[in-house]
Structures are given as structure tokens and as C-alpha cells.
């Protein structure tokens, strides 16, 4: 009863002589486990015996024993769901129907599976996509309705015998639904693959060839074109004729339209495979190609460069770069449309031919001002000589030349004068726009290259100017040579080195720092009295009377300058000592008498000593000796001694007379 048995397996299995067959199979017996299984080859039901007749390939019994000759066929199933079978090796005569006779306790069933065994390995089958277009990736599939665990195989792809293995992916299926081996090749066909043979080759595990399938690729592609031109080099002269032919080397599908393009632009009314150009002009020079379209799209040929030859056109000169800076390099380029390119050039500078210059470019490595002017050229090729064009102007720029600083004043210049200087130059390009002066002083803003220095200083030695355009050119500095009266006149003691003592030899020097002109005269003066006209003033033996305020004068042709007054100090021991008495040398007793020790000394007396008529020193040391009240006994001769750092001096004796008062006389 078929309702009691449910089977799943491939309907037909394919193999070849010597290979194997693996039959994936599942079943369900609804009334219990399988008790008996027989595999028949081409079973036929015998109505008489109510049993199946046919070759028994495999038999399993209730006790589970399998005859030894049944090793080639293996039942890999179980008692309730798996009925997988393997035949290894499989033989040609195994072709036909396999009958799986299943028996459970109460039910029986014969399940039939078709087995197709060929004499030789059958070829795989290549499946192509419906359309293949150039450069678009497609997947080619190679399918073989065979797979068996005991017999490994491989599928290899070849394009005209060249392997394409890395882009292929192989998969196998051994399921109850399907048994196959499949290889998928990812492939980007080019137009050159059109019509070429692709092979899928079946190999055994050792790489031995078993069978193959081949297909011819139908690769859709735009027309592939070749362009031919007469003359073949595509070089003609004005007035010649040119023929271009467009040949389609490949097109799939067939082409539909043809057109011609020049420099990328379509030529009107040119829709045949031949392009005839009669009496060409130079304007027809350019890149030509043909374009042919099919359903895939347009295809273009390679470009043909048509060169129409003509004599050079009037030339123009391009200067790199103008204006040019003196000392820089300049390149002149002679530009003239010509075909073929000019082979010879003649160059002109200000209308005069430049000898030895025959190239397209003229290079001047170091430009000088005289290079300025108009440059023109003439180009020449095999077809003739062109005309000289208008030329180009070379402007050579340079800093101002021969810059000088000129003193406008009459010479000599004296300190305090107003000095006018001008900045002169020989030539300049571009024009001078400003001037600079060195040193920078707080002078009037210079304009138009003139500098006025008000009240010129004695020390304004040199002045330089620069004339400036884009650059500044400095003149050599000029010496103003400012003349002035002697400066910094001062008295300087040369000897002695220490202080001056009376009797010393003394020399004074009249110094000055500078004088212009250098020729000078000296004058020494003391208290308005002229003492000498030398630079030195000498005293063989100085006396205190020589002390005083001295000045020296230095004069030149510009003027005279006096030193500051210089005080000459002479040091000497106390002299001219005398004792003066107050109120007089006769004093009445009881009154006051003051004795003063007067002296002349430098430095002043620092210490006094008083002596009496007995040369007895008195205990008094100041300049004044005061006797109060004076007594008659005080009468007598007194003298004093003065001391300074230089020495001592003493006075002569001075007599003091003290007379009695009337009272004393009255008492007597």
C-alpha cells in the first residue's frame, strides 16, 4: 500500500563504467521498522509466485547477514528512515531500474530508481547567460549530473586551451533532491573573445581527461574599426587629395550607421566608409576618425592625424619675459604656423639681422641694456619662407647707472653753513621715483634728488645718495670736508705730576680735540695779559705770584676757541709772618690786648706756635693770642711760628708795652 511508505530520492542517477553511484535516499514506513530489504536490478513481478524476479544486487535478512559477494553494493541505510545506497564500482550493465524491496511486519513495497550508466564519462553541460556583452562580468556554468563520494572529479575551464582556473568556483550536491557537480566561472569577456571556444573539461582525481563540453562565445560588442588613409603617412600639401577608408574588423551585431569625425566633431554629409577630401586646405589638418554604430553602441577607430603642409605664416615673437631685468636670461620664441615645422629661422634686432641665430629660440643668458629693442624673425620650411611679423619689444630694466652725489656749495664748507647736495645719475629704466641718503639725518625731506642740510655740523664727514627705481643704486660717499674752529680746547698740566710747590718747574699744555683746517695758533693769557704763543707755557721756578687763572686760545682760519679758565695753585711754606697788635703795641694794664700772627701761606697755616722774649713757647696755638686783662708783666717782645703742609715760617719780634693805669700810678 503506497500510502504506508513515503520515499525521497533522485528519480534518475547517472554514472559511467568504472565510476560509482551514490544514491541518497530517505523513507518512512508508517507501520513500523524495516525487517527485510532486497535491492533488485530490473525487477519484474511474477503473478504466479506473487514475488519479484530479477537480479538481486543486495539482500539483508532478519538476522542481518549479507552475502560476501555483495561488497560492491552497500546499503547505508537503517530500519526507519535512511535508504542510501552505494555501488562502487558501477558497471555498464548496472543501467536500468533499481528496485528497493522493503518489508515491514505487515507491509511490503517496491520503490524504483532509474540508473543510467554510460560506457564512457559523459560530458558536462555549459550554460551561458542569454546575452554576453564585452567587458561586462558574466557567470558561465558547467553542470555535470554526477557526484559520488568514492570517485572524486574536477571541472576545469579553458579558453582555447588556456586555463581560467582562479575565477571558477566548484560545488557538489548529493541530496535526495539532486546529484550534481557544478563549476561557475566569473568572466569579463572582451570583444576579442567573440566566436572563440570555451571548454569545460571533466577530469578525474589525478587530473586525467574524462570528457568535455565546448561552447562558442557570442560576445556582443561595439564595432571594432581600422582606418586606412591614402597617402599612408597622411601628409599632404595644400591642394592635394586625401582618401580615408573605414574597415570594420568586428561587429556583433551587424553595424547600422557610419560617420566621420574631425577633432571630435562630426563631419556633415559623410556617411559612407570612404571619406574623400579634394584640394585640401591647411584648415583641414587635424585628427580624423570614423565612427560606426550597432545596437550595442558606437565604436571609434584610432585617430589619423592629417597634416596639410604649407609655407610658414607671418611670424610673431614671444619674449620670456619682458620687461627683463639686466643680468637675467631671456628667451625669444619665433612663432609661425607652418607644416612641416620650420627648419630655419632668421632673427632681427632693431631691423638688423642677428648673425648665427637660426633656431626657433634665441637664448640670451645675460641681458644688458643694449639688448633692448624690437625683435622680429622669419621662419622657413621646405615649402618656402614666411614673412617677418611686427616683432616684439624687449624692455630691459636696470638700476640707475653712474649715480653721483654732488655738493652744490662753494668750497670750503664751514660749520653752520647750509649745504645743498644733489643726487645725479646717468640713466635709469624704469625712471627714478625716489632717492635715499646716508646717513639718515633729521634733514629736510629730500625731493627731486636735492638734499639741504641746514646748519651743517662740524662732524658731517661723508654723505651718500641712492637713486631708486625698482632698485636703489648708491653713489660713492662724498666728503663734505666741513671746516670749523678748534674744538674742546683745555689747559692741561704736564708737570709736575703732583701739586705745584713754589720753586717747581711747571709746564702747562694747551690741548684741543680737532681743528679743520689743521693749522692753528696758540695764545696764553692770565688776567687779560698775553703770556705766550706756544702750545706750552713753561715756568722754570714757579713762585706764588705766578698762581692765578690761566686761559689758552687756539685759533685757525675759521675762528678761535678759548679754554675754560684754569687755576694755577702754588703751594709754599708760611712766609711774611708778622705779629700785629690790637688795639696797638702800647696797652694800659687791665685792658685787653690781642696779638695776631699774620702770614702768607698756601695751603693756609694749620698750626701756630707763640714764643715770648725768652723764646719760651706759650701754651697758645691759635692765630690770635688774647691777653685779658693785660698786665705790666706781659710787656716784652713776642714772635710767632706758622706751620702748613709745606713747612714752617717765623715772624720777627714785635714788642708789646703795657703801662700802668692811672689808678696804679695814683696808688703809688
Amino acid at each position: 500500500d503506497s500510502s504506508k511508505w513515503v520515499f525521497e530520492h533522485p528519480e534518475t542517477l547517472y554514472a559511467w563504467e568504472g565510476a560509482c553511484v551514490w544514491i541518497p535516499c530517505t523513507y518512512r514506513a508508517l507501520d513500523g521498522d524495516l525487517e527485510s530489504f532486497i535491492l533488485f536490478h530490473n525487477p519484474e513481478y511474477n503473478k504466479n509466485t506473487s514475488k519479484f524476479d530479477g537480479t538481486r544486487l543486495y539482500e539483508s535478512t532478519k538476522d542481518g547477514k549479507v552475502p560476501s559477494e555483495q561488497k560492491r553494493v552497500q546499503f547505508l541505510g537503517d530500519k526507519n528512515k535512511n535508504c542510501t545506497l552505494s555501488i562502487h564500482p558501477v558497471h555498464l550493465n548496472d543501467s536500468g531500474q533499481l528496485g528497493l524491496r522493503m518489508e515491514s511486519k505487515t507491509e511490503k513495497w517496491m520503490e524504483r530508481i532509474h540508473l543510467n550508466v554510460s560506457e564512457r564519462p559523459f560530458p558536462p553541460h555549459i550554460q551561458l547567460p542569454p546575452e554576453i556583452q564585452e567587458s561586462q562580468e558574466v557567470t558561465l556554468t558547467c553542470l555535470l549530473n554526477f557526484s559520488c563520494y568514492g570517485y572524486p572529479i574536477q571541472l576545469q575551464w579553458l579558453l582555447e586551451g588556456v586555463p581560467m582556473r582562479q575565477a571558477a568556483v566548484t560545488s557538489t550536491s548529493l541530496t535526495i533532491k539532486s546529484v550534481f557537480t557544478r563549476s561557475e566561472l566569473k568572466f569579463s569577456p572582451q570583444w576579442s573573445h567573440h566566436g572563440k571556444i570555451v571548454t569545460c573539461q571533466l577530469q578525474d582525481a589525478d587530473g586525467k581527461f574524462l570528457s568535455n563540453d565546448t561552447v562558442q562565445l557570442n560576445v556582443k560588442h561595439t564595432p571594432k574599426l581600422e582606418i586606412k588613409v591614402t597617402p599612408s603617412d597622411a601628409i599632404v600639401r595644400e591642394g592635394d587629395s586625401v582618401t580615408m577608408t573605414c574597415e570594420v574588423s568586428s561587429s556583433n551585431p551587424e553595424y547600422t550607421t557610419v560617420s566621420w569625425l574631425k577633432d571630435g566633431t562630426s563631419l556633415k554629409k559623410q556617411n559612407t566608409f570612404t571619406l574623400n577630401l579634394r584640394e585640401v586646405t591647411k584648415d583641414q589638418s587635424g585628427k580624423y576618425c570614423c565612427q560606426v554604430s550597432n545596437d550595442v553602441g558606437p565604436g571609434r577607430s584610432e585617430e589619423v592625424f592629417l597634416q596639410v603642409q604649407y609655407a610658414p605664416e607671418p611670424s610673431t615673437v614671444q619674449i620670456l619675459h619682458s620687461p627683463a631685468v639686466e643680468g637675467s636670461q631671456v628667451e625669444f620664441l619665433c612663432m609661425s604656423l607652418a607644416n612641416p615645422l620650420p627648419t630655419n629661422y632668421t632673427w632681427y634686432h632693431n631691423g638688423k639681422e642677428m648673425q648665427g641665430r637660426t633656431e626657433e629660440k634665441v637664448h640670451i643668458p645675460k641681458i644688458l641694456p643694449w639688448h633692448a629693442g624690437t625683435y622680429s624673425c622669419v621662419a622657413e620650411n621646405i615649402l618656402g619662407t614666411g614673412q617677418r611679423g611686427p616683432g616684439a619689444e624687449l624692455d630691459v630694466q636696470y638700476p640707475p647707472k653712474k649715480v653721483t652725489t654732488v655738493i652744490q656749495n662753494p668750497m670750503p664748507i664751514r660749520e653752520g653753513d647750509t649745504v645743498t647736495l644733489s643726487c645725479n645719475y646717468n640713466s635709469s629704466n624704469p625712471s627714478v621715483t625716489r632717492y635715499e641718503w646716508k646717513p639718515h639725518g633729521a634733514w629736510e625731506e629730500p625731493s627731486l634728488g636735492v638734499l639741504k642740510i641746514q646748519n651743517v655740523g662740524w662732524d658731517n664727514t661723508t654723505i651718500a645718495c641712492a637713486a631708486c627705481n625698482s632698485w636703489c643704486s648708491w653713489a660713492s660717499p662724498v666728503a663734505l670736508n666741513v671746516q670749523y674752529a678748534p674744538r674742546d680746547v683745555r689747559v692741561r698740566k704736564i708737570k709736575p705730576l703732583s701739586e705745584i710747590h713754589s720753586g717747581n718747574s711747571v709746564s702747562l699744555q694747551c690741548d684741543f680735540s680737532s681743528s679743520h683746517p689743521k693749522e692753528v695758533q696758540f695764545f696764553w693769557e692770565k688776567n687779560g695779559r698775553l703770556l705766550g704763543k706756544e702750545s706750552q707755557l713753561n715756568f722754570d721756578s714757579i713762585s706764588p705770584e705766578d698762581a692765578g687763572s690761566y686761559s689758552c686760545w687756539v685759533n685757525n682760519s675759521i675762528g678761535q676757541t678759548a679754554s675754560k679758565a684754569w687755576t694755577l695753585e702754588v703751594l709754599y711754606a708760611p712766609r711774611r709772618l708778622r705779629v700785629s697788635m690790637s688795639p696797638g703795641d702800647q696797652v694800659m694794664e687791665g685792658k685787653s690786648a690781642t696779638l695776631t700772627c699774620e702770614s702768607d701761606a698756601n695751603p693756609p697755616v694749620s698750626h701756630y706756635t707763640w714764643f715770648d722774649w725768652n723764646n719760651q713757647s706759650l701754651p697758645y696755638h691759635s692765630q690770635k693770642l688774647r691777653l685779658e686783662p693785660v698786665k705790666v708783666q706781659h710787656s716784652g717782645a713776642y714772635w710767632c711760628q706758622g706751620t702748613n703742609s709745606v713747612g714752617k715760617g717765623r715772624s720777627p719780634l714785635s714788642t708789646l708795652t703795657v703801662y700802668y693805669s692811672p689808678e696804679t700810678i695814683g696808688r703809688r
Epitope: S135, Q156, L158, L159, E160, G161, V162, P163, M164, R165, Q166, A167, S188, Q190, S192, H193, K196, I197, Q201, Q203, G207
Partner: antibody, heavy 116, light 116 residues
């Protein structure tokens, strides 16, 4: 039995040309792609060129592209390698090899020396 | 760029197991490669093909001691119970076809020495 026999190796000067040949027997020549492989003096193998079974496709290594041309005569079962503008770096033993899925058969090789 | 990298030499004791490595450039790590062996003054001989999953098949006359495996971009040629006659150079190779350009690249070769 597959047999591949190379010939044409020689001593040449840089810039000169030479043509190598390879005679095949023992298999259907027109069914297989064929190649030239060279072995340089430092013993390195370098693939040079391959031609498809009926000659529609030719492939070259970058080092010889534009100088070498591979060709075949399926009637005479012969493979050729035309070498122009030879350089000292082309000095090698040149093997002719049958290309199945891999190089399954090789000739014994012919020696090219490029030296001034 | 398709590149194969091999170590230049390897030494093994007689009877030991040897494992040679051929490494593909990283962007080509899924490619199938071939191993060839070359005795001195002889052409190379196909040894085996190894796929990315390690499955392989060996050429005619190659002993069962030779096997192949794969890991990432590495393809291995293993020789068990190495013998004196296995002392030679082993070179790996790989082919590719990109658009309409076929290329074949060889590794630098590994010189195998059998000690003892």
C-alpha cells in the same frame, strides 16, 4: 608518449634577433595551449609567453612584451618564439611546455646567450 | 600583483618529514597553485596541484609520500619519510587570467637538502 624538442638556441649580441622552435609529438597538438618558460642563470623560472590552442590568443610577460612573438603551426605541430632586440637579461635556458591546466609536459630546453 | 614567496633552502634528516611553504600575495590567497620539482640539468616536473581548501592531486610517478595542504595564503608540500632522491629544487607556480590577459608566475624555488 608526449615529446617536446626545442631548437635554435645560440650565442648572439645585444640588439640582435633569433627564432626558437619546438617540435611536438605524442599528443593532439591543436588541442593544447603551448608556452615558453625560461630559466635564468640564477636558476629562477620565468614564464615568457603562451599561445592558445588554435592561436587566436597570445599572452606575454611584461619583460618581453613588444620584443618577442609566439606563434604556432598546428599542421606541423610546431611552436615558435621570434625574439627581437635581445638583451643580456634574456640569457637563459628556454623550455617549451604544454599547458593543460598546469605545465604538464616540458622539453629539455635550448640555451640562449646574449653577450657583447 | 600576483606573487609567490618561497624560502630559498631547507635541510631535513633522512627519513624525517618535510614541509615546504609557498605563500601567495594576500589578495590572491584563494588561488590554486602547482608544485614542480627540478633535478639539476633537467626540465621541471609537475608534482601536485593544491586548492585553497587543501584538496590536491599528484602527478604521474609521484610517490604517495608526497601530500599537500593549505592554510590561508600558504600552500604546503609535505614529504614523509624523506629519501635521498627527494633532494632537489621545488618550485611553486600559479596562473591567472584577468580580462583578456593570462599570466603565469613562479616562486623563487626551495632547494631541499637531505642530511645523513
Amino acid at each position: 608518449e608526449v615529446q617536446l624538442v626545442e631548437s635554435g638556441g645560440d650565442l648572439v649580441k645585444p640588439g640582435e634577433s633569433l627564432k626558437l622552435s619546438c617540435e611536438a609529438s605524442g599528443f593532439t597538438f591543436s588541442n593544447y595551449a603551448m608556452s615558453w618558460v625560461r630559466q635564468t642563470p640564477d636558476r629562477r623560472l620565468e614564464w615568457v609567453a603562451t599561445i592558445s590552442s588554435i592561436g587566436s590568443f597570445t599572452y606575454y610577460s611584461d619583460s618581453v612584451k613588444g620584443r618577442f612573438t609566439i606563434s604556432r603551426d598546428n599542421v606541423k605541430s610546431t611552436l615558435h618564439l621570434q625574439m627581437n632586440n635581445l638583451k643580456s637579461g634574456d640569457t637563459a635556458i628556454y623550455f617549451c611546455a604544454r599547458l593543460g591546466v598546469y605545465f604538464d609536459s616540458w622539453g629539455q630546453g635550448t640555451t640562449l646567450t646574449v653577450s657583447s | 600583483q600576483l606573487v609567490l614567496t618561497q624560502s630559498s633552502s631547507a635541510s631535513f634528516s633522512l627519513g624525517a618529514s618535510a614541509k615546504l611553504t609557498c605563500t601567495l600575495s594576500s589578495q590572491h590567497s584563494t588561488y590554486t597553485i602547482e608544485w614542480y620539482q627540478q633535478q639539476p640539468h633537467k626540465p621541471p616536473k609537475f608534482v601536485m596541484e593544491i586548492k585553497k581548501d587543501g584538496s590536491h592531486y599528484t602527478g604521474d610517478g609521484i610517490p604517495d609520500r608526497f601530500s599537500g595542504s593549505s592554510s590561508g595564503a600558504d600552500r604546503y608540500l609535505s614529504i614523509s619519510n624523506i629519501q635521498p632522491e627527494d633532494e632537489t629544487i621545488y618550485i611553486c607556480g600559479v596562473s591567472d587570467m584577468i580580462k583578456d590577459q593570462f599570466v603565469y608566475v613562479f616562486g623563487g624555488g626551495t632547494k631541499v637538502t637531505v642530511l645523513g
